[in-house]
């Protein structure tokens, strides 16, 4: 799996989308998990409703929400009030039994708030932004990691 980078601004909301084949994953619940270390387990953050029929219900765990458009084949995760500690590698998963298929690997990057004058040296202005209907969502941009790029900082 390639890793897709989603960038968001600290204090704002970031929306992550994970497209999938709706027929292949028909009837399967989905989950969003955080990768603990390069080879560590993926720790569940939030999952869709236990009733697959109600996957469209937005479920929250703290400041993270998940909702699944099972017809269109898009899993959407919202990270509200993005903080520096939210940065890291995540996965969108499709669940079946005790197994989980990775739908997408996601690297979340948190950028300094350009309106926060305490750190004016780190100003970041989104060059390519997507706007969403959801009022909570401000801006997010995504790209795929280039070959050879490492999602985790090298450990010393």
């Amino acid at each position: 799996h390639n890793t897709t980078v989603f960038q968001g601004v600290a204090g704002q909301s970031l929306q992550v989308s994970c497209p999938y084949d709706s027929m292949k994953h028909w009837g399967r619940r989905k989950a969003w998990c955080r990768q603990l270390g390069e080879k560590g387990p993926c720790q569940r953050v939030v999952s869709t409703h236990n009733l697959w029929l109600l996957s469209f219900l937005r479920r929250w765990n703290g400041s993270t929400a998940i909702t699944d458009d099972t017809l269109g084949g898009t899993l959407t995760i919202t990270l509200r009030n993005l903080q520096p500690h939210d940065a890291g590698l995540y996965q969108c998963q499709s669940l079946h039994g005790s197994e989980a298929d990775t739908l997408r690997k996601v690297l979340v990057e948190v950028l300094a708030d350009p309106l926060d004058h305490r750190d004016a040296g780190d100003l970041w202005f989104p060059g390519e932004s997507e706007s969403f209907e959801d009022a909570h969502v401000e801006h997010s941009i995504s790209r795929s990691l280039l070959e050879g790029e490492i999602p985790f900082p090298p450990t010393s």
Epitope: N50, L51, L54, L57, R58, R59, W60, N61, D69, D134
Partner: antibody, heavy 124, light 106 residues
Framework: QVQLVQSGAEVKKPGASVKVSCKAS????????MHWVRQAPGQGLEWMGI????????SYAQKFQGRVTMTRDTSTSTVYMELSSLRSEDTAVYYC?????????????????WGKGTTVTVSS | EIVMTQSPATLSVSPGERATLSCRAS??????LAWYQQKPGQAPRLLIY???TRATGIPARFSGSGSGTEFTLTISSLQSEDFAVYYC????????FGGGTKVEIK
């Protein structure tokens, strides 16, 4: 106005099956999910299952798996709940209740319209 | 399965007084909680959903609060038609109802 009209009271013997109907009117039948909830005499409410009237997909509470079947007839805007292998503990009032249908990223769920209930008595 | 516990089982209140009903979930249900009112021989009626949003046509004297595992339904000034049984229901993980609180005339 939005209405759910249920079939009349039933008296059944242990081991038999019962099929309760719930006819919807006043809204687009296929746009809202339907739930079945039961209430034993003097007891609380117990969720049994859900059906999507559009495609007919169902999910049942684990307790009723294998004994309950929910179906629908879109031509008459009616949903059905059939419970088999009846026992005395199944004596209850059975309600159909409407819940929101498939809407992307709905924040909260609920059951906003209820039928008046169908009394099912299981007795030998 | 998430267990919903309501307290008290019975609440004796005089008309015009305030009634506070409690509902506790065995694990977090976020704000996916609804309150229903049921009178003898009648079907339940939706009062509150999303823990605090009043359903259409519900009087302002009914209010809901809480999130996570602790929820409250408050009836600010009880009217004669409010004496009934009240159920909470979590809709975050399957669907389970609390055992109910009967609000009776003192």
């Amino acid at each position: 106005q939005v209405q759910l009209v249920q079939s009349g009271a039933e008296v059944k013997k242990p081991g038999a099956s019962v099929k309760v109907s719930c006819k919807a009117s006043g809204y687009t039948f296929t746009s809202y999910y339907m739930h079945w909830v039961r209430q034993a005499p003097g007891q609380g409410l117990e969720w049994m299952g859900i059906i999507n009237p559009s495609g007919g997909s169902t999910s049942y509470a684990q307790k009723f798996q294998g004994r309950v079947t929910m179906t629908r007839d879109t031509s008459t805007s009616t949903v059905y709940m059939e419970l088999s292998s009846l026992r005395s503990e199944d004596t209850a009032v059975y309600y159909c209740a409407r819940g929101p249908g498939y809407t992307t990223a709905l924040d909260y769920y609920y059951m906003d319209v209820w039928g008046k209930g169908t009394t099912v008595t299981v007795s030998s | 399965e998430i267990v919903m516990t309501q307290s008290p089982a019975t609440l004796s209140v005089s008309p015009g007084e305030r009634a506070t009903l409690s509902c506790r979930a065995s694990q977090s249900v976020s704000s996916n909680l609804a309150w229903y009112q049921q009178k003898p021989g009648q079907a339940p009626r939706l009062l509150i959903y999303g823990a605090s949003t009043r359903a259409t046509g519900i009087p302002a004297r009914f209010s809901g609060s809480g999130s996570g595992t602790e929820f409250t339904l408050t009836i600010s000034s009880l009217q004669s038609e409010d004496f009934a049984v009240y159920y909470c229901q979590q809709l975050d993980d399957w669907f389970t109802f609390g055992g109910g609180t009967k609000v009776e005339i003192k």
